[in-house]
Amino acid sequence: SIPWNLERITPPRYRADEYQPPDGGSLVEVYLLDTSIQSDHREIEGRVMVTDFENVPEEDGTRFHRQASKCDSHGTHLAGVVSGRDAGVAKGASMRSLRVLNCQGKGTVSGTLIGLEFIRKSQLVQPVGPLVVLLPLAGGYSRVLNAACQRLARAGVVLVTAAGNFRDDACLYSPASAPEVITVGATNAQDQPVTLGTLGTNFGRCVDLFAPGEDIIGASSDCSTCFVSQSGTSQAAAHVAGIAAMMLSAEPELTLAELRQRLIHFSAKDVINEAWFPEDQRVLTPNLVAALPPSTHGAGWQLFCRTVWSAHSGPTRMATAVARCAPDEELLSCSSFSRSGKRRGERMEAQGGKLVCRAHNAFGGEGVYAIARCCLLPQANCSVHTAPPAEASMGTRVHCHQQGHVLTGCSSHWEVEDLGTHKPPVLRPRGQPNQCVGHREASIHASCCHAPGLECKVKEHGIPAPQEQVTVACEEGWTLTGCSALPGTSHVLGAYAVDNTCVVRSRDVSTTGSTSEGAVTAVAICCRSRHLAQASQELQ
């Protein structure tokens, strides 16, 4: 019967007793930077080309016995998971292996850098179809390694990496912390985060998604027909590299941004038990388990968005946090979150010719996060309209006044500390839904976009009694672009998007009391693109 991991990544419509994905990734080449491999294993012989690249440190210890099958173990298994005939994800993908890890599984930053440069040069000398680079390794944070990954990604290469097996924040490791890399955590057959001895999968905002990574059957270097189970985020990353190869084989023109958005979109949502993660990491860690799309074609009509969290600002009074979208993505909204509730909101601002989302800490606050909603919106023209604090008691309001521009997100930012303390809630006037409204002491920012066929609507969910969490979701066919709270009273910790749901978090209700101050409204802006839908129908 089908191994659990292959069943897990297969959409229900393809599920059978055997794993038979619609396309095997035959147009894609996957580069594996790992240990040496046993290339004559029946799983991968003829599918994996061993390059002459080798850059590894000496093994530790004078009594180390170099045994070929041990040296090849990790790489052989991963090559099998990616493209193995029997237990592989992308059975049609061809691979090239580079040796950057020694027989003890250790490597160096310099060896990996030279390996990445080798791939870049190979790509220039002999351009092929789409390239996926699998980096099933993790070391301490390295600015230079992250920069090398960024360069390769900007040259059109898809990089997939392991989050790391340290039961820690993936942002502390490289290449996992590189924003351009697709970083993968590991889950088990119960969709729970993988525990490995006293440690386990890494987590946090630098993880893009999770994938099967425990008890994964794959090629064993013990013998040419042997199979073995291995576990870890390397195995999880290999699954995503295989899925990416299949997606790229079906749609070779996909950009890295488009691929990442699709991986997120087609993942299984909210299946991981977040209690395994440290409390402060739960909100930052994506609850996503990778899966193949139900159809390899026809996803083009959807408006894809993802949520990007910034690093924590730190606690100083004027501290800020910045969240950025990828180069090919549009920032459609910006929100902020603080566990203490002490924040001065957020704003969208231009930086290097691109909009970023900046959140501001408040005096006495423990720090803030900026949360960007990053979307794929071809031919978009977006701008931010700002209304300074209003004199009138009705509060500050701003709308999209340019012809053909629609509201995709609202942000508010204020200079005074603890805005909203003992202030009545601001209510949006009836019949004027497409504008941003806030306190009169706040400056309000509206994200206004023009794109062919783009239409958006505002959806609200208000709860009169105090509650720790208020949510509002966009319906089927619509995508959440903006998420904010109305009003910005002091007990609101912030707002953020989780998949297609806008979440507004408040302070513990026991400390709030049940006055009108407890009323919280979550405001979602839901958009869709009729242009993308029509374009997709024409292609079919």
């Epitope: 191994p3 059978a16 007793d17 055997e18 794993y19 038979q20 095997g24 029946r42 012989e45 003829g46 599918r47 099958s69 173990s73 005939r85 029997d86 237990a87 059975k91 049609g92 059957i217 064993s220 270097s221 013990d222 013998c223 040419s224 027909t225 042997c226 199979f227 073995v228 189970s229």
Partner: antibody, heavy 119, light 113 residues
Framework: QVQLVQSGAEVKKPGESLKISCKGS????????ISWVRQMPGKGLEWMGI????????KYSPSFQGQVTISADKSISTAYLQWSSLKASDTAMYYC????????????WGQGTLVTVSS | DIVMTQSPDSLAVSLGERATINCRSS????????????LAWYQQKPGQPPKLLIY???TRESGVPDRFSGSGSGTDFTLTISSLQAEDVAVYYC?????????FGQGTKVEIK
């Protein structure tokens, strides 16, 4: 029900060519390896070679390399064993067997094809 | 190539008695990563294709009577029929499947005494 059905018995003259077949049903033919095994009259089992129908990757026993060709047509779930020039010593029963990958061994066998080569 | 040698070549056992067949491989078929022996036993009755009895040296294939058992590790293996039945008259083959070429033992013929 999972089964392998082989083509019927053949009587040939030395020097003639021959292609025998093995059709899989009741399972995903593409995803399982097919081995061919020879059994000469009154003798034991000899593994000849194997094919993965998904990509037609083959592996031969050194004893049979160059003597026979193994192929497959996944569109009709059929594997083949062929000779370009038969010899009297090729007289034998030939079995195809499905190879289950995790336990790489032969869990399902065809009924066998008897090939007789005689002048 | 891994050479498989079976003993005895033939064996005559009374109904209800124990039959024991040995198989030796020229090199170990036990692998440390999954601690499995890549050895199988097959039964072939006259005019029929072989039938899988045992894999991983000691795991019975589903539907195989429990009077058949396999043991051994590394290079030395045994197939035991605890109480021979009339329908067990056949030739039994061991097979290694750890590396290409896959190889069989020469076979052991089991008859009723």
């Amino acid at each position: 029900q999972v089964q392998l059905v082989q083509s019927g018995a053949e009587v040939k003259k030395p020097g003639e060519s021959l292609k025998i077949s093995c059709k899989g049903s009741g399972y995903s033919f593409t995803n399982y390896w097919i081995s061919w095994v020879r059994q000469m009259p009154g003798k034991g089992l000899e593994w000849m070679g194997i094919i993965y129908p998904g990509d037609s990757y083959t592996k031969y026993s050194p004893s049979f390399q160059g003597q026979v060709t193994i192929s497959a047509d996944k569109s009709i779930s059929t594997a083949y064993l062929q000779w370009s020039s038969l010899k009297a010593s090729d007289t034998a029963m030939y079995y195809c067997a499905r190879d289950y990958w995790y336990k790489p061994l032969f869990d399902i066998w065809g009924q066998g094809t008897l090939v007789t080569v005689s002048s | 190539d891994i050479v498989m040698t079976q003993s005895p070549d033939s064996l005559a056992v009374s109904l209800g008695e124990r039959a024991t067949i040995n198989c030796r491989s020229s090199q170990s078929v036990l692998y440390s990563s999954n601690n499995k022996n890549y050895l199988a036993w097959y039964q072939q009755k006259p005019g029929q294709p072989p039938k899988l009895l045992i894999y991983w040296a000691s795991t019975r294939e589903s539907g195989v009577p429990d009077r058949f058992s396999g043991s051994g590790s590394g290079t030395d293996f045994t197939l035991t029929i605890s109480s021979l039945q009339a329908e067990d008259v056949a030739v039994y083959y061991c097979q290694q499947y750890s590396s290409f070429p896959i190889t069989f033992g020469q076979g052991t013929k089991v008859e009723i005494k």
